[in-house]
Interface confidence: low
Amino acid sequence: QEFLLRVEPQNPVLSAGGSLFVNCSTDCPSSEKIALETSLSKELVASGMGWAAFNLSNVTGNSRILCSVYCNGSQITGSSNITVYGLPERVELAPLPPWQPVGQNFTLRCQVEGGSPRTSLTVVLLRWEEELSRQPAVEEPAEVTATVLASRDDHGAPFSCRTELDMQPQGLGLFVNTSAPRQLRTFVLPVTPPRLVAPRFLEVETSWPVDCTLDGLFPASEAQVYLALGDQMLNATVMNHGDTLTATATATARADQEGAREIVCNVTLGGERREARENLTVFSFLGPIVNLSEPTAHEGSTVTVSCMAGARVQVTLDGVPAAAPGQTAQLQLNATESDDGRSFFCSATLEVDGEFLHRNSSVQLRVLYGPKIDRATCPQHLKWKDKTRHVLQCQARGNPYPELRCLKEGSSREVPVGIPFFVNVTHNGTYQCQASSSRGKYTLVVVMDIEAFSSH
């Protein structure tokens, strides 16, 4: 009769570092002591006639255990294979490029340390929850790669690496480990430079808008813009509309920037840069300043009119040019009544890079002269009918402007000047029309001859 030695459990699966209770038993009636052969740490827990129980501890790797016993002088054996499973200690997705150009390939790399049995371990690369690659874990550490074509949709997408330890055939389920996700940033930067709209000339201490635009940029909101006038950085307002970026700044030229300068616009995205440059001339254009030696002159006095402007500026005063650019234009006159209110015009011309810039200025002269009554506008003899409506059309002139009053001789009766009034016989008589100002008086005699109204 043949006797057996049973080892239980048969071919167990346990997690790494675990313990296992093993029972060896035989139906041989005359068996000796049962022995357990293993490289693992073991302890006899109990034994009896034809059986022995052992505890195996800290089981870290796959192993085979063997029980043996002598029965009637011959050795009988029994064995069991222990399978150990373990989750990976590290699952890591390698860093992605800081910026990835759309339309170019990039590589996803995942490294897996530990995990057993390797035959049951699979590594999966994911975009969001979409599987990009599924590969078995082979070496230690296992390294899995996948090549991906970057698209706009990938901007901001999380990529991750997942391990699957499939112990379902052993009835233990599917064990999943996932790496920390990494976010990809993709970009499109056109090869064309930005469009830079800037003035050709900029006057010292004046401001002018500067615009820098680049189309076909993605994501436009992530782009950095640098706008500068020479080495002076401009404070730019950046706006995005779809794939178009527009930076607007106000360029203000300082006096120390006079001369040839450059406006620069740099657009940086994804570590790449596009640049546009425009030449600009900063110029100083002072004046023209028109000056009167006496803004208010007395009749007969000499008045000097001068016009000046900055260096290199050609001035022309009332059609008379200055001797050379940067010099003052001057004219002199004897102030007369007819010069009162006269305007003197000065034009200034500055050549900047072959272009002529023009500015004008004027000043008005006041001439002080005594009052006068224009005899042509003030008839000295008036023949009017009684009970009719008339206007005494006298006009005075002078600076300061005189007051004009017409008073009847021998009485304080006054007739209005320049205003319609009803004439009657009492208006008959001689009138003193007097124009008076701080510069004197001027009198003109006006006779009113009122013809009585005939009733038939």
């Epitope: 006057e203 010292v204 201490e205 004046t206 401001s207 002018w208 106000t250 203000t252 030229a253 300082r254 006096a255 120390d256 300043i289 500015r359």
Partner: antibody, heavy 119, light 112 residues
Framework: QVQLVQSGAEVKKPGASVKVSCKAS????????ILWVRQAPGQGLEWMGK????????TYNLKFKGRVTITVDTSTSTAYMELSSLRSEDTAVYYC????????????WGQGTLVTVSS | DAVMTQTPLSLPVSLGDQASISCRSS???????????LHWYLQKPGQSPQLLIY???NRFSGVPDRFSGSGSGTDFTLKLSRVEAEDLGVYFC?????????FGGGTKLEIK
């Protein structure tokens, strides 16, 4: 912080000259324009002129007909305003102020210097 | 010269009231560069003037938002939404579009 510190009060006789100083600190002196403004007792403000310290270029109010001279000493970051042929109506508080090219307004002012012209 | 005319000369108000000061120029203050260089200053009793508003409507740093400026061309206005005790003093408008720079005659804001 930006500061403009002016020299002390002056009493002058008619026909004399006065020179008021304005020491700037807290910014790069040659980056801003210095202006001078005066205020007669109980009156409004009157602009006298300005200077660009970088170039030393000046612009004056023609009302002062060559009586005013504005200068700078960039080594000490100090601006000066000299008014000659003084008359009693020049009695006023004289202020220095600065402006950047932008916003083109006088953003910081000195404390003022009282100049009294009296015989 | 650009003559600046301010109204009113005196503005008596109660604390918390709204106040409005007008400034009119004898010529347009629009510079050839398109900007308008009209500014507002406040001179508190015994102090130097201080900048409130530059280029019509821009508040200088540190100026409370109860101050606002508006206008164009030749007509400009400074408004205070709620007058506080620290706002009392003389308000001046000023232009720097044309040389010589000129100031308004001032408006005294005082307690009723």
């Amino acid at each position: 912080q930006v500061q403009l510190v002016q020299s002390g009060a002056e009493v002058k006789k008619p026909g004399a000259s006065v020179k008021v100083s304005c020491k700037a600190s807290g910014y790069t002196f040659t980056d801003c324009i210095i202006l001078w403004v005066r205020q007669a007792p109980g009156q409004g403000l009157e602009w006298m002129g300005k200077i660009n310290p970088y170039f030393g270029t000046t612009t004056y109010n023609l009302k002062f007909k060559g009586r005013v001279t504005i200068t700078v000493d960039t080594s000490t970051s100090t601006a000066y305003m000299e008014l000659s042929s003084l008359r009693s109506e020049d009695t006023a508080v004289y202020y220095c102020a600065r402006k950047e090219a932008y916003p083109d307004a006088m953003d910081y002012w000195g404390q003022g210097t009282l100049v009294t012209v009296s015989s | 010269d650009a003559v600046m005319t301010q109204t009113p000369l005196s503005l008596p108000v109660s604390l918390g009231d709204q106040a409005s000061i007008s400034c009119r120029s004898s010529q347009s203050l629009v510079h050839s560069n398109g900007d308008t260089y009209l500014h507002w200053y406040l001179q508190k009793p015994g102090q130097s003037p201080q900048l409130l508003i530059y280029k019509v409507s821009n508040r200088f740093s540190g100026v409370p938002d109860r101050f606002s400026g508006s206008g164009s061309g030749t007509d400009f206005t400074l408004k205070l939404s709620r007058v506080e005790a620290e706002d009392l003093g003389v308000y001046f408008c000023s232009q720097s579009t044309h040389v010589p720079y000129t100031f308004g005659g001032g408006t005294k804001l005082e307690i009723k």
